[in-house]
């Protein structure tokens, strides 16, 4: 008789990534009987919520429910109704909410409260909304990419199932760039992690990992830009800021109140004789790079070596996956190819930033001007952060892999977060069992 497939025994999970600039909802799926196997969870849907990050709703919390509706309804459609009540939903908020909490714990609690009320009305198993720490964000990003790359599997393969896979079990480091923070996480080579705050110990699938991680709050691409503007306006002679990080011919008016709204610019705050100033782009990569470097304090280091701002950083080791805004920005600039050297990236950035704004607008007519205008800054910032901030070199640049997805799942902290909260990463290696035939009769 012919084998007939029974209804698949699968489980689902939902994670909302409430970032500083936007919120994304991810739906994951896995075979119920293989929960402890490595690499079985995969992303089946990503839904980007229309609008800004949740921290921007602080004065309009009544709009949060509507804001989340479309993506939550999408989840309701994608996940079979019979599974709704067993599907966990987690919301993790990152640096945008960390910054809001620094300003006012009450306001951050208010936003989270209304987010939770809204999400609890859906028929899923809502497990709460919380602000994750920078350390968690780094750690879960590292877990995600290594889980998807098959690095936790003890079975060595003679063939490669995913891109970037070298056949060894050496884990990849994780480089994550958001709007408000950036994380660096990797396993150093036989190096003591000199600052306890940056040390993580994991036992995953029977193997111990000593992991270094740090999250630089205010060094995401959007907050870094605010920092740079606040620093540069200090020395401007009038209300015109000639800015090398924007294309020649670009003009934009900035409110001083907006500039000083974020805790990230507090160190540069001063009384200015004007309420607004105008950015006038001059499009010069080298000058932009120099201006960005002034955001990194490298004069002080209480350890054997540091990244910047006195933060310990061990010598870089192995390959790195660079994801989130590292990938989105470099993808836009067409610089994600493994074959593009660091020198070539720098050359292309010089050319790109020097292009007149009118020309750029014509070439990328489909791209929102707000985003389009900032690629010169963002690309230059990525180079500055990786080279001067994290000490990558022209030689070690080839160890950076700009990754958007692995095996169809987005690189980022959300998958690792869910794997941890659903206890799907065992400390010990599961006993290998014969292949299950239970799905056939």
């Amino acid at each position: 008789t012919q084998n007939k497939a029974l209804p698949e025994n699968v489980k689902y999970g939902i994670v909302l990534d409430a970032g500083s600039s936007h919120t994304s909802l991810y739906i994951y799926k896995w075979p119920a009987e293989k929960e402890n196997d490595t690499g079985v969870v995969h992303q089946v849907e990503e839904c980007r919520v229309k609008g800004p990050g949740i921290s921007k709703f602080v004065q309009k919390v009544n709009e949060i429910g509507i804001y989340l509706t479309d993506c939550m309804e999408r989840a309701r459609e994608v996940i079979p109704r019979s599974q709704h009540q067993e599907t966990p939903v987690y919301l993790g908020a990152t640096a945008g909410m960390r910054l809001l909490r620094m300003e006012s714990e009450e306001l951050a609690d208010r936003v989270l409260d209304v987010v939770e009320r809204s999400l609890s009305n859906y028929p899923f198993d809502f497990q709460g909304a919380r602000i994750i720490t920078g350390q968690e964000e780094g750690a879960y990003g590292w877990i995600t990419i290594n889980y998807l790359l098959g690095k936790f599997s003890q079975k060595t393969r003679w063939f490669s199932i995913v891109p970037y896979e070298t056949n060894n079990q050496e884990t990849f480091g994780a480089l994550d760039l958001g709007g408000a923070s950036t994380q660096v996480t990797f396993v150093p080579q036989n190096q003591t992690i000199e600052s306890p705050d940056n040390a993580l110990q994991f036992r995953l699938y029977g193997k111990d990992y000593n992991v270094y991680t740090h999250s630089f709050l205010c060094y995401g691409k959007d907050q870094a830009l605010w920092q740079k503007l606040a620093k540069d306006i200090q020395v401007a002679s009038n209300e015109i800021l000639r800015d090398p990080c924007f294309h020649p011919g670009y003009k934009k008016v900035v409110n001083v109140s907006d500039l000083y709204k974020t805790p990230c610019t507090k160190r540069f705050e001063m009384t200015l004789p004007f309420q607004q100033f105008e950015i006038q782009g001059i499009g010069n990569y080298q000058q932009c790079h120099q201006s960005i470097l002034e955001l990194f304090n490298t004069s002080y280091c209480p350890y054997s070596q540091c990244a910047f701002n006195g933060i310990f950083l061990p010598p870089l080791q192995g390959d790195f996956g660079a994801f989130s805004a590292f990938y989105f920005v470099m993808k836009f600039l067409n610089l994600t190819s493994e074959k593009v050297s660091q020198e070539k990236v720098t050359e292309m950035m010089k050319k790109f930033c020097a292009q007149p704004w009118e020309e750029i607008k014509t070439s990328y007519a489909g791209v929102k001007e707000k985003y389009l205008s900032e690629y010169c800054f963002s690309g230059t910032y990525i180079l500055s952060l990786l080279l001067q901030g994290y000490h990558f070199t022209a030689d070690s640049w080839e160890h950076i892999h700009f990754i958007g997805k692995i095996q169809g799942s987005d690189a980022g902290w959300t998958l690792g977060y869910m794997l941890n909260l659903t206890n799907m990463i065992p400390a010990e290696q599961p006993l290998s069992t014969p292949l299950s035939h239970s799905t056939y009769v």
């Epitope: 009544n62 609690d109 208010r110 009320r117 609890s120």
Partner: antibody
Framework: QVQLVQSGAEVKKPGSSVKVSCKAS????????ISWVRQAPGQGLEWMGS????????NYAQKFQGRVTITADESTSTVYMELSSLRSEDTAVYYC??????????????WGRGTLVTVSS | EIVMTQSPATLSVSPGERATLSCRAS??????LAWYQQKPGQAPRLLIY???TRATGIPARFSGSGSGTEFTLTISSLQSEDFAVYYC?????????FGGGTKVEIK
Amino acid sequence: QVQLVQSGAEVKKPGSSVKVSCKASGGTFSSYGISWVRQAPGQGLEWMGSIIPQFGTANYAQKFQGRVTITADESTSTVYMELSSLRSEDTAVYYCAREAGYYRYRYFDLWGRGTLVTVSS
Amino acid sequence: EIVMTQSPATLSVSPGERATLSCRASQSVSSNLAWYQQKPGQAPRLLIYGASTRATGIPARFSGSGSGTEFTLTISSLQSEDFAVYYCQQHALWPLTFGGGTKVEIK
């Protein structure tokens, strides 16, 4: 000081609806939530739903979803709980209770005296 | 939803004695747990929140402890006005849920 004053006892027929009110007397509602909790005769406490009057954001226990509606009128500092399709099992004392704060502070620091709703044919 | 289980259902204690009431959550609620006292014909009254913080005006003989899934309310020396029903409530996640209650009666 603020007190939560609830409307009087109600006797209702099965299948009908009841609307219970809860007014902040001697002040206004804080900006935090107001929950409704019921207690059937001789039974324990059961949370039904909540609203933040200032924002109109309501949420409900799955058990009551579609059958309960919580609204607020900020101008009169009153919160309402309407329960429809009543059945005999809905016979209970219905309390409104003030939440002490946002997010993880959702315990009840002030309670109304309760409204007895009897559902009987 | 988080299921809250209280034990014992009834506790018989003599005045002046110590009473220990337990509350267990079906999953971790960290320290987000409150205790209430309810007397016949009255609304509940908040005693403890955050697992161990006494509410305003609550006598020192009432104390709460625990975190995660296991919690305890202790009444160090029972007074006549303490004979009542006690409920625990988790305030970590929606839906907010209560335990079934423990009746403290005179022995």
